[in-house]
Amino acid sequence: EPPTACREKQYLINSQCCSLCQPGQKLVSDCTEFTETECLPCGESEFLDTWNRETHCHQHKYCDPNLGLRVQQKGTSETDTICTCEEGWHCTSEACESCVLHRSCSPGFGVKQIATGVSDTICEPCPVGFFSNVSSAFEKCHPWTSCETKDLVVQQAGTNKTDVVCGPQDRLR
């Protein structure tokens, strides 16, 4: 009876279990009753990082100098290239697809410490009573407006991203 499931590092095809190709190799032809799976090493600047049945290897990531990137770790047939930013620059994401001089703090966050040549911007959440409604690399959280000092009342509460809205006091006639 043909198998319905295969062991680890195998795959099911044409009612039989074939060996997967090891990392660094791609599939050329599936196994048959009489032959083993045929695999071929990935070419230069290509990789596959898992046991697989892929017919094409993946291209190594390109660290584009026009985006401020450089190679941190050269790729192998089993691993992708790892990019990093030129000195003094910072990755925009964990994948490091581009570089910025320093990151900015989003609305709801203020700048705790402005970036230097060696450290990126440090952001902090705006605490109760403070807000930031902009993305900035230098602005701190701003205190909510004090309606009382303007002889006004709070008409709309503030948040970490918005100031309070003040309005006139209701006068009793």
Epitope: E86, T92, L101
Partner: nanobody, 116 residues
Framework: EVQLLESGGGLVQPGGSLRLSCAAS???????EMWWVRQAPGKGLERVS?????????YYADSVKGRFTISRDNSKNTLYLQMNSLRAEDTAVYYC?????????WGQGTLVTVSS
């Protein structure tokens, strides 16, 4: 395409003044926080000054406080840096940059040399 074109640099004696300009195009200038950043020969990038989109709030590095003034004219899509009481240590290439400071959007800069 974002373009930032710095100008106004040159050779000036210590104690002298210069006004740098940065002409911006390819984006809505009035929506962006802008910075002046400089790089002295053989040194890293130093954040000099920043201004919010409306031009109402500013930041200055301690090294230039009281001597430099950042401003902007949103109707002309232009950023300025007025530099007074210049010192030898202000010698650098000055760049303007827009949030979020992508490497790909930097101009060529303008060279300021302070020397007697």
């Amino acid at each position: 395409e974002v373009q930032l074109l710095e100008s106004g640099g040159g050779l000036v004696q210590p104690g002298g003044s210069l006004r740098l300009s940065c002409a911006a195009s390819g984006f809505t200038f009035r929506d962006y926080e802008m910075w002046w950043v400089r790089q002295a020969p053989g040194k890293g990038l130093e954040r000099v000054s920043a201004i919010n989109p409306q031009g109402t709030r500013t930041y200055y590095a301690d090294s230039v406080k009281g001597r430099f003034t950042i401003s902007r004219d949103n109707s002309k899509n232009t950023l300025y840096l007025q530099m007074n009481s210049l010192r030898a240590e202000d010698t650098a290439v000055y760049y303007c940059a827009k949030l979020p400071f992508p490497f790909s959007e930097w101009g060529q800069g303008t060279l300021v040399t302070v020397s007697s």
